[in-house]
């Protein structure tokens, strides 16, 4: 019951988080005009990952897309990439986790398969959350750097007769949405990973009975099909996570994920 609740909660938290990451990515207010210690202008500037906008006091708002790809700063491109990777991983994670939910029955899917899918989606959510947090943090760092550079310009560039209003940008709402959303996705992912441990089938107390056939030595364990799937107890007397090292007959017996390109 606790496992189902943890898995369900993890799914919901991740869902909210990914929705937040999508919202943050689409938002125009990644950076907003700094109003502190600046002349009060009748124009308010703000910028997003995809376009920059100007809102006049009269209410008129005009947004212009960044139609160039090569002319944009590398950092902005990197942030875009991180956010998109985060969204894609999160979306795949959500899809996987829907089928992994213990409360949803799909055919005769074993708990072990669900456990694996839960772990997979959990890892995807964690990486998705980290991508969003990284993207937002990179952008925030870029803003801080530019803010202090423009502040320096503001006080050094006033030697002439004509003063220019230096528009400085500070953190926009999208940054906070992104941080919170990334954090939620991360938490959801962790919860899914925790739920995976509870979903994994317990080791039985029965001793495995070994039947020695004339050919290969194969151990049969109670549990039917589970023994031959990748999700059950390991049939060979070696660690599951062996770093990819396999015996010759094992490579022949079990198709590897690398066999299909």
């Amino acid at each position: 019951m606790a496992v189902t609740a943890c898995q369900g909660l993890g799914f919901v938290v991740s869902l909210i988080g990914i929705a937040g990451i999508i919202a943050a990515t689409c938002m125009d207010q990644w950076s907003t005009q700094d109003l502190y210690n600046n002349p009060v202008t009748a124009v308010f500037n703000y910028q997003g990952l995809w376009r920059s906008c100007v809102r006049e006091s009269s209410g008129f708002t005009e947004c212009r897309g960044y139609f160039t790809l090569l002319g944009l700063p590398a950092m902005l491109q990197a942030v875009r990439a991180l956010m998109i990777v985060g969204i894609v991983l999160g979306a795949i994670g959500l899809l996987v986790s829907i089928f992994a939910l213990k409360c949803i029955r799909i055919g005769s899917m074993e708990d072990s398969a669900k456990a694996n899918m839960t772990l997979t989606s959990g890892i995807m959510f964690i990486v998705s959350g980290l991508c969003a947090i990284a993207g937002v943090s990179v952008f925030a760092n870029m803003l801080v750097t530019n803010f202090w550079m423009s502040t320096a310009n503001m006080y050094t560039g006033m030697g002439g007769m004509v003063q220019t209003v230096q528009t400085r940008y500070t953190f926009g709402a999208a940054l906070f949405v992104g941080w919170v959303a990334g954090g939620l996705t991360l938490i959801g992912g962790v919860m899914m990973c925790i739920a995976c441990r509870g979903l994994a089938p317990e080791e039985t107390n029965y001793k495995a009975v070994s039947y020695h056939a004339s050919g290969h030595s194969v151990a049969y364990k109670p549990g039917g099909f589970k023994a031959s799937t990748g999700f059950g107890s390991n049939t060979k007397n070696k660690k599951i996570y062996d770093g990819g090292a396999r015996t010759e007959d094992e490579v022949q017996s079990y198709p590897s994920k690398h066999d299909y390109v």
Epitope: Q47, V54, S57, T167
Partner: antibody, heavy 118, light 113 residues
Framework: QVQLVESGGGVVQPGRSLRLSCAVS????????VHWVRQAPGKGLEWVGV???????NYESALMSRFTISKDNSKNTVYLQMNSLRAEDTAMYYC????????????WGQGTLVTVSS | EIVMTQSPPTLSLSPGERVTLSCKSS????????????LTWYQQKPGQAPRLLIY???TRESSIPARFSGSGSGTDFTLTISSLQPEDFAVYYC?????????FGGGTKLELK
């Protein structure tokens, strides 16, 4: 048809108060701002202040302490409250609609004359 | 606050002539966000309220004849009337619509020579 009509002007003694009204028709004050501009006899235009659609106001720095702009959206009317009037406040007072582009004024009222004299 | 300086204060001209009015601001009126200059030009005839001619320094208001054009950027702006018509003799004002307070220039009076 957008129309702005100012009223409330007249002769007032120095130190007294006066409230000017700008009745707006054809548009909603919830969507547009209104500027107040004055013009002393034979002089140029002087911006007094503005009340934006959201209700926030901005003023000419020298007038901020004495003048207050407010509005009543239900009556579609903007007010200019002038306190501690001085002789130099004698002018024709205009209200103008804040145009959607460039924060400029595209429609103006005919003006109301305020004379501060003892 | 921004000081708007218009020159010359008065111009005596004849109909059909080309005229250029100057307006200078003490601070740049160029907004980096949209690369637009927040300067407006108005025309005022005696006994009348001002009339909007040009906003964003160069965008002509819909009802304004094509002979009126605005140009300039940053701190230096001009209003050009390509061929003066009798109805164009009036006072022209420029206004800063960027930084509060939204100050006006002193005006340039166009009078008939």
């Amino acid at each position: 048809q957008v129309q702005l009509v100012e009223s409330g002007g007249g002769v007032v003694q120095p130190g007294r108060s006066l409230r000017l009204s700008c009745a707006v028709s054809g548009i909603s004050l919830t969507r547009y701002g209104v500027h107040w501009v004055r013009q002393a006899p034979g002089k140029g235009l002087e911006w007094v202040g503005v009340i934006w659609a959201g209700g926030n106001t901005n003023y000419e720095s020298a007038l901020m302490s004495r003048f207050t702009i407010s509005k009543d959206n239900s009556k579609n009317t903007v007010y200019l409250q002038m306190n501690s009037l001085r002789a130099e406040d004698t002018a024709m007072y205009y209200c103008g609609r804040a145009y959607g582009k460039g924060n400029s004024m595209d429609y103006w009222g005919q003006g109301t004359l305020v004379t501060v004299s003892s | 606050e921004i000081v708007m300086t218009q020159s010359p204060p008065t111009l005596s001209l004849s109909p059909g002539e080309r005229v250029t009015l100057s307006c200078k601001s003490s601070q740049s009126l160029l907004n980096s966000g949209n690369q637009k200059n927040y300067l407006t030009w108005y025309q005022q005839k005696p006994g009348q309220a001002p009339r909007l001619l040009i906003y964003w320094a160069s965008t002509r208001e819909s009802s304004i004849p094509a002979r009126f054009s605005g140009s300039g950027s940053g701190t230096d702006f001009t209003l050009t009337i390509s061929s003066l018509q009798p109805e164009d003799f009036a006072v022209y004002y420029c206004q800063n619509n960027y930084i509060y307070p939204l100050t006006f220039g002193g005006g340039t009076k166009l009078e008939l020579k």
